[in-house]
């Protein structure tokens, strides 16, 4: 009888099924929806999380309109195809054979087409801008305190290496967090900025993906930081390919 058997859950992903049937009774966890093995010492990929979210029973699902994106992703939630490593497949299709290409965070980056649509590679999202507006406070937050607290959050809660938090901007009431991570910068074991941003987005909405942890309690020098609006912009290493018709609509 081991400690793993007493608490066989996944600390970093509550959307899992776990059982103590690994070596020496260790806890082995699989993502809902895909059944894929999950590493509970780090963040789960956004693709597997979306798949798990779509597989959850309708009455257990919290329907929240997704953020607006730089790529104007108004498609909402979808049930994605993930590769064996849990990343988004470059081409996604729905049940009616409508297909489109996505970037590494699963956001559509082309017009929709049919099954003949080709998506040659998964284009990496290398720059994410998280744009927040906080609720009114007695005064503005101190910029350096705010900067330090948000960097600490991404380092400790999401395990994102500090070098990938490029900047924190603040003009009351708007806070902007810039995450940057080129393909060449991302080493094995590094948390992906897309996954960190998704966990943060869900935390901000009060839908934490962490097992048994309380919701996100953001404080700057003891003062609660309450977010009332979130926009996330994704920039890809290769610009998206939309027709002019869409751009002028």
């Amino acid at each position: 009888h081991t400690a793993a058997q007493d608490n066989c859950t996944c600390p970093t992903n509550k959307m899992t099924v776990c059982s103590p049937d690994g070596p020496g009774g260790r806890c082995q966890c699989r993502a809902l929806g895909s059944g894929m093995a999950v590493d509970c010492s780090t963040l789960t990929s956004k693709c597997l999380l979306l798949k798990a979210r779509m597989s959850a029973p309708k009455n257990a699902r919290t329907l929240v309109r997704p953020s607006e994106h730089a790529l104007v992703d108004n498609d909402g939630l979808y049930d994605p195809d993930c590769d064996p490593e849990g990343r988004f497949k470059a081409r996604q299709c729905n049940q009616t054979s409508v297909c489109w290409c996505v970037n590494s965070v699963g956001v559509r980056r082309t017009d929709k087409g049919d099954l003949s649509l080709r998506c040659d590679e998964l284009v990496r999202t290398h720059h994410i801008l998280i744009d927040l507006r906080h609720r009114p406070t007695a005064g503005a937050f101190n910029h350096s305190d705010l900067d330090a607290e948000l960097r600490r959050l991404f380092r400790e809660r999401y395990r994102l290496h500090p070098k990938f938090v490029a900047a924190v901007h603040y003009e009351q009431p708007t806070i902007q967090i810039e995450l940057r991570q080129n393909t060449s910068q991302k080493a094995a074991g590094d948390v992906d900025i897309g996954d960190a941003a998704y966990y943060f987005e869900r935390d901000i909405k009060g839908e934490s993906l962490f097992q048994g942890r309380g919701g996100l309690d953001l404080r700057v020098r003891g003062e609660p930081l309450q977010v009332e609006r979130t926009l996330i912009y994704y920039l890809d290493e290769i610009p998206p390919k939309f027709s002019m018709k869409r751009l002028t609509a």
């Epitope: 070596p23 260790r26 806890c27 082995q28 093995a37 999950v38 590493d39 010492s41």
Partner: nanobody, 121 residues
Framework: QVQLQESGGGLVQPGGSLRLSCAAS????????MSWVRQAPGKQREWVSY????????YYADTVKGRFTISRDNSKNTLYLQMNSLRAEDTAVYRC??????????????WGQGTMVTVSS
């Protein structure tokens, strides 16, 4: 990139033996924990055996304990599974996997394509 290539599978009679090999490349094999997993037709993949990076610690699923032996040769970047006293219920696709073991959790992150083992008279 990580590559794992299994070999040694085949058709064997109940009570017989097979030795599976797994050639690894694309990562520092000598510092990686490894496992063998298997998947029988229509069943979920199950963990079979685990070995730590230097070969000093091994674990076996109850279903194969005493019959299977996992080993590795870090100088050849190769993982092995010696299977004795084979039974019909051992029939499955066997895959080697890179693994990670903590005090409480176990996970595999890369798998080979697999080699088929059929135990039948």
């Amino acid at each position: 990139q990580v590559q794992l290539q299994e070999s040694g599978g085949g058709l064997v009679q109940p009570g017989g033996s097979l030795r599976l090999s797994c050639a690894a490349s694309g990562f520092p094999f000598s510092s990686a924990d490894m496992s063998w997993v298997r998947q029988a037709p229509g069943k979920q993949r199950e963990w079979v055996s685990y070995i730590n990076a230097d070969g000093s610690k091994t674990y076996y699923a109850d279903t194969v304990k005493g019959r299977f032996t996992i080993s590795r040769d870090n100088s050849k970047n190769t993982l092995y599974l010696q299977m004795n006293s084979l039974r019909a219920e051992d029939t499955a696709v066997y895959r080697c996997a890179r693994a990670k073991l903590t005090d409480t959790h176990y996970v595999e992150d890369y798998w080979g394509q697999g080699t088929m083992v059929t135990v039948s008279s």
